[in-house]
């Protein structure tokens, strides 16, 4: 084994060093000491280090680890940041789109009914963008509103013209009336299932994307414990209390240091793969009636077709609606 | 019958279904994400290791530190022999994760759980009992899958996928009508987001 | 927290338009999920909805009242304005405007002290 | 007219229960909240989305809401709940209040 070399008589070296981290030279000893008050340096015989550098050597190891850890994951969460915000905004124009087409659809094709039309549709689409971004909204309840909110404007400007300006008041007869006869046939059901399926899925996907940068940032800031800053300080700085300025660690040494201060982060593994894995296996299933880009796109033709069955099946539904509703009509009329 | 919503615009700019040859949509780009995550997939069992490359260590054939003495090569028991008065390295390891890893752990596992429930397996089809009693059925292929563009008559049966950047740049907007408050036109940073999302790495 | 605070004329003339403002603070009308809604009270008389704007600028209004009704935001300011055209003696009321959740079916969870 | 019906006023005895109702066709099917008012005061949450208690508000105050009645339950009435009480609930695209229980 070769003899370490001589210690700096003068502890010059040290203190130059020292400077850069901790202006003013008070806690460096001018010449070597026993160092018999060190907890983590211990010497073999005389040192350029005292109690006060040393716990600025530990202070400054846990800083570099910080540093070293931010700088490691950079990368990874820059990736995840940047595509969930892309994502995000995505979603929310492919929803605009949505509610144009729609609209459109009603202007091209059903004029009287615009403008409450418009307005039904965009609480639909305000629900729609709510519930993927997190909100306690339920796909069903939404799309029920959207076909309740729709039947009485379509039932007094299309299927009865001659009635007054609907009130609140037939209006709620016609929603049940609504339900009860299934008057858009099986449309809403499948509007239902097709939106659930898209949105959950989308859902999902953004709540999963915001999770990983949640991950990151909890590794990212993670403060070590004082026994890993001693082990760290140990690794980095110790050498310096004995003049060895340009000796560094060993790497099998660092490897252990790091498992040591780590043992707590590197529990995550296991999860972390089977995130990456399963957010693969949801992405690989996002299409068709799982892609909402799909079926929000589409969904102004299918609203068009419940709307095209309303009126083919209107003569029946006249009939059994006036009966239904009469009193409040009557009501309306005087 | 109905139309296309781009019949609308045929007197503003008229929406072209552009075939670009590398048109990058929603699902592309998903597939994109997770090819770079996969790359990052041991991440954390890798941490030490990369942190001890982009950390000062010493070359394999020269003298180094072992965190007691200047020597030719890293012996782990005699490293750890220089340690036993001070602190273990076993007991730091056997302490656990800090309370914030564990509770990060238990959101992943609960998020894992979501995400494997969701996932769609290979196949599934839709269930066939959506036509109930009601005036008539609901006018829907045998594919309940391939109904979400309605019914025929000239109708396209699925819209075709927003091009997840080419299309963005039209002007999808619905503004006059009336009663739209909705300001549909792709705001400029809408545009630029998508256009320089070159290759995140 | 969240706090909102009206302004606007104490007094105004028939057929005269009054505009209300309200500045808030503690949210932002940028963020989704967002809204802000006016609300008046006639003395003595019950709470009556006027207009709500959300986040993504669509606006509601209340159907009698629409064809006299304008709202905007201005995000930047944190502010919500309200004009009422061809005002009348039966438009006395204090005037409210309120934060509003819009995924939580519209509630109305904070609410300014009002102006008469 | 309100199409949200509330008595105009109700009564009960400290410490008792006192029941506020709230009728409207279907209602159910609704989300429904509940404010409360005191003289000369702005209107304070107290019940949202049917059952729902804000922070703040004492657990003495809860909520149901089923078929054509919605009702706001202060159980253990105090003085200090003398006030009006407003129930409100969106219907496709129009904000309604009900005429309000003394």
């Known amino acids: 084994q070769p003899p370490p070399p001589p210690p700096d008589a003068t502890c010059h070296q040290v203190r130059s060093f020292f400077q850069r981290l901790q202006p003013g030279l008070k806690w460096v000893p001018e010449t070597p000491v026993p160092g018999s008050d060190l907890q983590v340096c211990l010497p073999k015989g005389p040192t350029c280090c005292s109690r006060k550098m040393e716990e600025k050597y530990q202070l400054t190891a846990r800083l570099n680890m910080e540093q070293l850890l931010q700088s490691a994951s950079m990368e990874l969460k820059f990736l995840i940041i940047q595509n969930a915000a892309v994502f995000q905004e995505a979603f929310e124009i492919v929803v605009r789109h949505a509610k144009n087409y729609t609209n459109a659809m009603f202007k091209n094709n059903y004029p009287s009914l615009t403008p409450q039309a418009f307005e039904f549709v965009g609480e639909f689409f305000t629900d729609v963008s709510l519930y993927i971004l997190g909100s306690d909204i339920n796909v069903d309840d939404m799309v029920n509103e959207l076909f309740d909110s729709l039947f009485p404007v379509i039932y007094t400007q299309l299927m009865n013209p001659g009635l007054p300006d609907s009130a609140l008041d037939i209006n709620e007869c016609l929603r049940g009336a609504r339900r009860d006869l299934k008057v858009f046939g099986n449309f809403p059901k499948l509007i239902m299932t097709q939106v659930s399926k898209s949105l959950q899925v989308t859902r999902i996907f953004l709540q999963a994307l915001n999770l990983g940068i949640e991950v990151i940032n909890t590794t990212d800031h993670l403060k070590f414990s004082k026994d890993c800053g001693r082990m760290l300080t140990r690794m980095w700085y110790c050498s310096y209390c004995q003049g060895l300025m340009m000796v560094k660690p060993c790497g099998g040494y660092c490897n252990v240091v790091m498992q040591g201060c780590m043992a707590g982060v590197v529990e995550i593994d296991k999860y972390w793969r089977e995130y990456i894995l399963s957010l693969e296996e949801l992405v690989n299933g996002m299409y068709r009636i799982y892609d909402m880009e799909n079926v929000l796109l589409g969904l102004f033709s299918t609203i068009h077709d419940s709307i095209q069955y309303v009126q083919k099946n209107a003569g029946k539904l006249t009939t059994t609606i006036g009966k239904l509703c009469a009193h409040s009509q009557q009501r309306q009329y005087r | 019958s109905a139309y296309y919503p781009e019949d609308l615009f045929i007197d503003k700019k008229v929406l072209k279904v552009a075939h670009v040859e590398h048109e990058e949509t929603l699902s592309s780009r998903r597939r994109e994400l997770i090819q770079k995550l996969k790359s990052f997939i041991s991440f954390y069992s890798a941490l030490p290791g990369y942190i001890c490359s982009h950390s000062p260590v010493a070359e394999n054939d020269t003298l180094c530190w072992n965190g007691q003495e200047l020597v030719e090569r890293y012996s782990q028991k005699a490293a750890r022999n220089g340690m036993k008065n001070q602190f273990n390295l076993h007991e730091l390891k056997m302490k656990g994760p800090e309370p914030v890893v564990s509770q990060i752990i238990d959101k992943l596992k609960h998020i894992n759980q979501l995400l494997r429930t969701m996932s769609v397996p290979k196949g599934r089809v839709l269930d066939k009992n959506l036509d109930e009693e009601g005036f008539e059925s609901g006018d829907c292929g045998d594919d309940e899958d391939e109904c979400i563009g309605g019914s025929g008559d000239g109708m396209m049966k699925v819209k075709n996928q927003l091009r997840f950047l080419a299309e963005l740049a039209y002007d999808l907007d619905v503004d006059d009508v009336p009663g739209n408050n909705q300001q549909a036109t792709p705001k400029d940073n809408e545009i630029s987001t998508f256009h320089n999302l070159g290759n995140v790495h | 927290q969240v706090t909102l605070k009206e302004s606007g004329p104490t007094l105004v003339k028939p057929t005269q338009t009054l505009t209300l403002t309200c500045t808030f603070s503690g949210f932002s009308l940028s963020t989704s999920g967002v809204g802000v809604g006016w609300i008046r009270q006639p003395p003595g008389k019950a709470l009556e909805w006027l207009a709500l704007?959300?986040?993504?600028?669509?606006?509601r209004y209340s159907p009698s009242l629409k064809s006299r009704l304008t709202i905007t935001k201005d995000t930047s300011k944190n502010q919500v304005v309200l004009t009422m055209t061809n005002m009348d003696p039966v438009d006395t009321a204090t005037y409210y405007c309120a934060h509003s959740r819009i995924a939580a079916r519209r509630v109305l969870d904070y609410w300014g002290q009002g102006t008469l | 007219q309100s199409v949200l019906t509330q008595p105009p006023s109700a009564s009960v005895a400290p410490g008792k229960t006192a029941r506020i109702t709230c009728g409207g066709n279907n209602i159910g099917s609704k989300s429904v909240h509940w404010y409360q008012q005191k003289p000369g005061q702005s209107p304070v949450l107290v019940i949202y989305q049917d059952t729902k208690r804000p922070s703040g508000i004492p657990e003495r105050f809860s909520g149901s809401n089923s078929g054509n009645t919605a009702t706001l339950t202060i159980s253990g009435a105090q003085p200090m709940d003398e006030a009006d009480y407003y129930c409100q609930a969106w219907y496709s695209t129009i904000m309604v209040f009900g005429g309000g229980t003394k």
């Open positions: 704007i959300y986040w993504n600028d669509d606006k």
